[in-house]
């Protein structure tokens, strides 16, 4: 009689997570009588997957009825495959005995599990940064197999090149994780911008997964301040406005000071949005010129998004001659910038403005 051979025809089998895996095995002879066992791995630490003779293996079913006469098909089907099931499976013939004696093993079938990556999660910086600064965005996706994966970054549809990607672990594993960090230079126009992390994997059938982050969460656009003054009114009052322009986010407090004394404090709320996502706000102050003997120094102090206050000052000249309705302005902008004007250059006042 021919010597028994245990044949595992497939060297490898690839299965999607959640599906069933069929591991084929046939014996070439009915002799000797004895059971088949399936193991994952080799050596003393091998894991018993199925024992024809004894035990309870709820996820494993023999493909061929083991009670079938002259059965030499010992293939098994493993249901609900997960990445943890990956490994090399061996069909091993035993000779009947007390105990049964291991006789011959098949060559093994490597089971690889195709598992989809999780939806990419993109996280931005913990604190906001201003234009021209570089911020980092991180993209993470987990639980995929095999290890090969492609990750791309986009900003408003344009592919980014400044990023670093790691796939872990480096060695063999049942599943893998990817982490990528992209560096993005902010501009003042980025309030409506979006970064997208795109992950492509064999399990996704060419339909990549995307994770997004809004730059609105990462950016701070500091305001420009401008003063304007209307003509003196008949009641000797001058209307002075402080225009706070092109700022983001909306969180902003404005304080008027007359000769260094707080006159009024206001909080920005429910402002209309500019096309670019920034906000404008105008605040005005009526100055009663007749109540002052000397020139009035007005300061518009803006505290934006918890940052150090930005000041813009303005002098209202008190004239000696009487005022007439509709006459020319009796005040002039001295152009004093105690805390950087629209170009935000630092000055020497007690407030120190830190760029981020």
């Amino acid at each position: 009689e021919e010597e028994l051979q245990v044949i595992q025809p497939e060297k490898s089998v690839s299965v999607a997570a959640g599906e069933s895996a069929t591991l084929n095995c046939t014996a070439t002879s009915l002799i000797p009588v004895g059971p088949i066992q399936w193991f994952r791995g080799v050596g003393p630490g091998r894991e018993l997957i199925y024992h024809q003779k004894e035990g309870h293996f709820p996820r494993v079913t023999p493909v061929s009825d083991p009670t079938k006469r002259n059965n030499m098909d010992f293939s098994i089907r493993i249901s609900n495959i997960t990445p943890a099931d990956a490994g090399t499976y061996y069909c091993v013939k035993f000779r009947k005995g007390s105990p049964d004696v291991e006789l011959k093993s098949g060559a093994g079938t490597e089971l690889s599990v195709r598992a989809k990556p999780s939806a990419p999660v993109v996280s931005g910086p913990a604190v906001r940064a201003t234009a021209e600064h570089t911020v980092s965005f991180t993209c993470e996706s987990h639980g995929f197999s095999p290890r090969d994966i492609t990750l791309k970054w986009f900003k408003n549809g344009n592919e980014l090149s400044d990023f670093q990607t790691n796939v872990d672990p480096a060695g063999k594993s049942v599943s893998y994780s990817i982490r990528s960090t992209a560096r993005v230079v902010l501009t003042r126009r980025d309030v409506h911008s979006q970064v997208i992390c795109e992950v492509a994997h064999v399990t996704l059938q060419g339909d990549p997964l995307r994770g997004t982050a809004n730059l609105s969460e990462a950016i701070r656009v500091p305001p420009f301040l401008e003063f304007t003054q209307q003509s003196m009114r008949a009641d000797n009052q001058v209307n002075v406005t402080c225009q706070v322009m092109k700022f983001y986010p909306q969180r902003l407090q404005l304080t008027w000071l007359e000769n260094g004394n707080v006159s009024r404090t206001e909080m920005a709320s429910a402002l209309p949005e500019n096309k670019d996502g920034t906000y404008n706000w105008t605040s005005w102050l009526l100055v009663n010129v007749s109540a002052h003997r000397d020139d009035v120094k007005l300061t518009c102090q803006v505290e934006h998004d918890g940052q150090p206050a930005v000041n813009k000052s303005f002098s209202v000249k008190v004239s000696a001659h009487p005022k007439e309705q509709g006459s020319n302005t009796a005040a002039e902008n001295t152009g004093t910038n105690e805390r950087g004007s629209s170009d935000y250059k630092d000055d020497d006042d007690k407030h120190h403005h830190h760029h981020h």
Epitope: L30, V33, G34, Q52, D65, T67, K68, N70, N71
Partner: antibody, heavy 119, light 110 residues
């Protein structure tokens, strides 16, 4: 360790029925056929029938087809053989035996149950 | 049905001598290269014990003084050197179709 433990001896009157049990242990009950064989005093072995516990498929010796019924209870890994319309020549030791190689052979045997039919 | 006929019905052999028991089938019990013949040993008060399967293969734990041979319709069980513990009744069985047993051969010491 495969074990087949059979029920105790029975004494029956002619025309009665007997149900012999065979409790299996040490292996997966549903993966192997159970055979029933009898042996009259001083006589040879006579095959009665076989059952596949996984799906209750049965094969009977024509001689016993109308009088014997094989059943199994997979929850207790127990096989049963009922013989009806007993006659005195049914007096025998009744064995259950497990077919380990699915070759329709008898690899492991119970110790037997003596059924005596006497008026 | 396939009928199995054993010969002789009884046999007396001296200790250490060879014992041979024959089993003839009424038609071939061979299929797909296998001979579906099995040999059993039964000692008084005990259930039968499988010795040989598929005509020539020794079952687990069976001493190698036992051997089986034959094909088609004619088969032989041989005990190469009889031991006292081999005294028993020996049966052949086929499974080419539904199983049947031979009538048995009683082996004694001469």
């Amino acid at each position: 360790q495969v074990q087949l433990v059979q029920s105790g001896a029975e004494v029956k009157k002619p025309g009665a029925s007997v149900k012999v049990s065979c409790k299996a242990s040490g292996y997966t009950f549903t993966n192997y056929w159970i055979n029933w064989v009898r042996q009259a005093p001083g006589q040879g072995l006579e095959w009665i029938a076989m059952i596949d516990p996984s799906d209750s498929e049965t094969h009977y010796n024509q001689i016993f087809k109308d009088r014997a019924t094989l059943t199994t209870d997979t929850s207790t890994s127990t096989a049963y053989m009922e013989l009806r319309s007993l006659r005195s020549d049914d007096t025998a030791v009744y064995y259950c035996a497990m077919d380990y190689g699915s070759l329709y052979a008898m690899d492991y045997w119970g110790r037997g149950t003596l059924v005596t039919v006497s008026s | 049905d396939i009928v199995l006929t054993q010969s002789p019905d009884s046999l007396a052999v001296s200790l250490g001598e060879r014992a041979t028991i024959n089993c003839r089938a009424s038609k071939s019990v061979s299929s797909s290269g296998y001979n579906y013949i099995f040999w059993y040993q039964q000692k008084p008060g005990q259930p039968p014990k499988l010795l040989i399967y598929l005509a020539s293969n020794l079952d687990s734990g069976v001493p190698d003084r036992f051997s089986g041979s034959g094909s088609g319709t004619d088969f032989t069980l041989t005990i190469s050197s009889l031991q006292a513990e081999d005294v028993a009744v020996y049966y052949c069985q086929h499974s080419r179709e539904l199983p049947t047993f031979g009538q048995g051969t009683k082996l004694e010491i001469k």
